[in-house]
């Protein structure tokens, strides 16, 4: 009998408001046994996969997706999904990445700490959850 897969979580380090040109790392978390984590951008047509999965705790695995130099075009909604054979999980909530001018005037927001349940997350649309394994090579733009 197939197990019910818990939804993944997503967070961002060092936060969700990133100065232009700085780096950000998205962290996806799921259960032990995940083979592929996928970071999706805005819609499922743009994504990056990784099999570099490591332990986050005795009961959790995680993967990290790093953008070395954030551009304005990187702003947007991100979410995670994972493949634990024989199926894909549901998507995580959305995390919104905001990109600010690096000069940073007095009114510009400070970098928010990374959070898997912060105010920049939006519920994901799980109305269509058909995903093929990464090994089948879905055509998609890459995030970076």
């Amino acid at each position: 009998q197939e197990e019910d897969l818990p939804r993944p979580s997503i967070s961002a380090e060092p936060g969700t408001v990133i100065p232009l040109g700085s780096h950000v790392t998205f962290v996806c978390r799921g259960p032990v046994g995940v083979q592929t984590f996928r970071l999706e951008r805005d819609s499922r047509s743009t994504y990056n996969d990784t099999e570099d999965v490591s332990q986050a705790s005795p009961s959790e695995s995680e993967a990290r997706f790093r953008i070395d130099s954030v551009r304005e075009g990187n702003a947007g909604l991100y979410r995670c999904i994972y493949y634990k054979p024989p199926k894909w999980s549901e998507q995580s909530d959305y995390l919104e990445l905001l990109v600010k001018e690096s000069s940073g005037g007095p009114d510009s927001p400070d970098t928010e700490p990374g959070s898997s349940a912060g105010p920049t997350q939006r519920p994901s649309d799980n109305s269509h959850n058909e995903h093929a394994p990464a090994s089948q090579g879905l055509k998609a733009e890459h995030l970076y």
């Epitope: 790392t25 032990v32 046994g33 995940v34 083979q35 990056n48 996969d49 990784t50 099999e51 570099d52 999965v53 490591s54 332990q55 705790s57 005795p58 009961s59 695995s61 993967a63 990290r64 997706f65 790093r66 990464a134 090994s135």
Partner: antibody
């Protein structure tokens, strides 16, 4: 189909050096952490080293027995994994396997390193 | 470092029987455990990952159980090709240590 092909093994004298290579194909190499595992003749398996992906800053990890003597590296553009072995000891004699993660799923056929005077 | 103690080192059994191998971790590793089979002169093959998940193409007579520090690996209804060596490995933290191995022999 996944293929991992190790090369570079051979006979080397104690305190000598050797560089092993592993050519990967059939999977997305640059999104996989990679490992070296060895097995001395008639003995069990020993994990040697691991290198993570670019998103993890190519972090490296080593067994205590090889720390400061062995260096793991990778070339994502060529889908190649390497193990530079310096100051070799007789106890480094083993079959060396290139192994993909996350769960040591795919193994190469191995390359034999013999350290002997 | 996490030590993995695998037992027995060798075991004799008959065709059709069941055998169980145990692996004990020196500290809790959740379910970050894998089991491998190795045939003479061949590379190891992943059988079980995440303590209980069967790898692709592995027959269902192989199974894994356990979490925390105690893990078991069972082969039900032994076939002739199963009389080889088996290893556990913890994947929780580096160094990713293996158990000492178990050699199955035909009784």
């Amino acid at each position: 189909e996944v293929h991992l092909v190790e090369t570079g093994g051979g006979l080397v004298q104690p305190k000598g050096s050797l560089k092993l290579s592993c050519a990967a194909s059939g999977f997305n190499f640059n999104t996989n952490a990679m490992n070296w595992v060895r097995q001395a003749p008639g003995k069990g398996l020993e994990w040697v080293a691991r290198i993570r992906t670019k998103s993890n800053n190519y972090a490296t990890y080593y067994a205590d027995s090889v720390k400061d003597r062995f260096t793991i590296s990778r070339d994502d553009s060529q889908s190649m994994l390497y193990l530079q072995m310096n100051n070799l000891k007789t106890e480094d004699t083993a079959m060396y396997y290139c192994v993909s993660t996350p769960y040591f799923t795919y193994w190469g056929q191995g390359t034999l390193v013999t350290v002997s005077a | 470092d996490i030590q993995m103690t695998q037992s027995p080192a060798s075991q004799s059994a008959s065709l059709g029987e069941s055998v169980t191998i145990t692996c004990l971790a020196s500290q809790t590793i959740g379910t970050w455990l894998a089991w491998f089979q190795q045939k003479p002169g061949k590379s190891p093959q992943l059988l079980i990952y995440a303590a209980t998940s069967l790898a692709d193409g592995v027959p269902s007579r192989f199974s894994g159980s356990g979490s925390g520090t105690k893990f078991s690996f069972k082969i039900s209804s032994l076939q002739a090709e199963d009389f080889v060596s088996y290893y556990c490995q913890q994947l929780y933290s580096a160094p990713y240590t293996f158990g000492g191995g178990t050699k199955l022999e035909i009784k």
